[in-house]
């Protein structure tokens, strides 16, 4: 299991239109539900729950989202719609270049996206917890233009490659 | 951050049409779903429709089909809402709302637009 | 369709209470579920979604529970700006339908 690089990039607009950036690091995992690849998109934060197939609305079809799903605690939903294997599907097949689970609430995931599948993702399928998931959610909870650039060896330094 | 800017109050004679405009800003227009909710006063909210940005594609509820026509101007990240024949029980505060990723919740709204139908 | 009954319609309670309203809908809805505050002249404001999740910014006195066809909405300790008109909202299945709104006065 490698270690992903995550660098997150928090776009604040200021009044004049400008942008200032704020860039983050964290570290998570590549799991073997997935390619061990980089990625790069703007986040797009999703409940475990929006990823089911509930309602009739059609899907956005855009592609090239870094999709941030934080588990639950599985006794919040002892039946869930998919496993999270089949959630990390459902995001790719709805236009994710990669897929970020926290998994803080929910360590036993790990195990379920580490246990092989003959028909791996050719997208990244990352987990992030503790420190990392922490920094990453704050982050997204910022309800703010976030991007997400994954990468499977340290970053360069200084980060330039950025560009909206 | 993000904010969705309503068009102002409107007063329309019974049978006429109104548009209302809803202009998005502060994050990716076309990847979010716009909903349209009504509240007439004094009234609960009831829900009218959705448009998705990105294809154009919509919906809406039975009752306001073929009374009801949403677009969107993706040049100005701007959706619309038009209600045609109205009558006077098409009196209420028009909302426009952004939707979460999964349909879990309008996480945004805007200020609201108040279309007064009389004679 | 499916129809939202709230309850009680109006409620009144003091500074410091804890208060409980409940929404029932009318066939399973799984945890398709929001919560939303509207104070007087201004628009809704998303409190709590797919049952139990509080959106960001949103105090912790705040927290729902439920799934299928039971749902609950707990302000744990009342507050002054907390008198409102809370509503549930399902959105399983279009016509995404609202409960009736319950008015929270100050007693």
């Known amino acids: 299991k490698e270690t992903a690089f995550v660098e997150v990039v928090l776009f604040e607009s200021s009044p004049s239109g400008d942008y200032t950036t704020y860039t983050t690091g964290l570290t998570g995992r590549f799991s073997r539900a997935g390619a061990t690849l980089s990625a790069e998109g703007e986040i797009v934060q999703m409940h475990p729950l929006g990823l089911c197939n509930n309602n009739d609305e059609e899907d956005l079809y855009e592609y090239g989202w870094v999709g941030v799903v934080k588990l639950e605690q599985p006794e919040l939903d002892p039946k869930p719609c998919l496993t999270v294997l089949g959630k990390a599907k459902r995001a790719v097949q709805r236009g994710a270049t990669a897929v970020i689970f926290d998994v803080s609430e929910n360590p036993e995931a790990i195990d379920q996206l580490n246990q092989g599948s003959e028909d791996p993702l050719k997208r990244p399928v990352v987990y992030v917890k503790g420190a990392d998931a922490i920094k990453l959610m704050n982050i997204v909870n910022k309800q703010k233009v976030a991007r997400a650039r994954i990468q499977h060896r340290p970053p360069r330094q200084p980060t330039e490659y950025f560009d909206m | 951050q993000v904010q969705l800017v309503q068009s102002g109050a409107e007063v329309k004679k019974p049978g006429a049409s109104v548009k209302v405009s809803c202009k998005a800003s502060?994050?990716?227009?076309?990847?979010?779903?716009m909903h349209w909710v009504r509240q007439a006063p004094g009234q609960g909210l009831e829900w009218m429709g959705w448009?998705?940005?990105?294809?154009?594609?919509?919906k809406s509820a039975q009752k306001f089909q073929g009374r009801v026509t949403m677009t969107r101007d993706t040049s100005t990240s701007t959706v619309y809402m038009e209600l045609s024949s109205l009558r006077s029980e098409d009196t209420a505060v028009y909302y426009c709302?952004?939707?979460?990723?999964?349909?879990?919740?309008?996480?945004?709204w805007g200020q609201g637009t108040l279309v007064t139908v009389s004679s | 369709d499916i129809q939202m009954t709230q309850s009680p319609s109006s409620l009144s309670a003091s500074v410091g209470d804890r208060v409980t309203i409940t929404c029932r809908a009318s066939?399973?809805?799984?945890?398709?579920l929001a919560w939303y505050q509207q104070k007087p002249g201004k628009a809704p404001k998303l409190l709590i979604y797919?049952?139990?999740t509080v959106e960001s910014g949103v105090p912790s006195r705040f927290s729902g529970s439920g799934s299928g066809t039971d749902f609950t909405l707990t302000i744990s300790s009342l507050q002054p700006e907390d008198f409102a008109t809370y509503y549930c909202?399902?959105?399983?299945?279009?016509?995404?339908?609202f409960g009736q709104g319950t008015k929270l006065e100050i007693k």
């Open positions: 797919a049952a139990s």
């Open positions: 709302a952004r939707v979460l990723r999964g349909s879990l919740g309008f996480d945004y």
């Open positions: 448009i998705n940005p990105n294809t154009g594609g919509t």
């Open positions: 066939q399973d809805i799984s945890r398709y």
């Open positions: 502060g994050y990716t227009f076309t990847s979010y779903y």
């Open positions: 909202q399902q959105s399983y299945r279009s016509p995404y339908t």
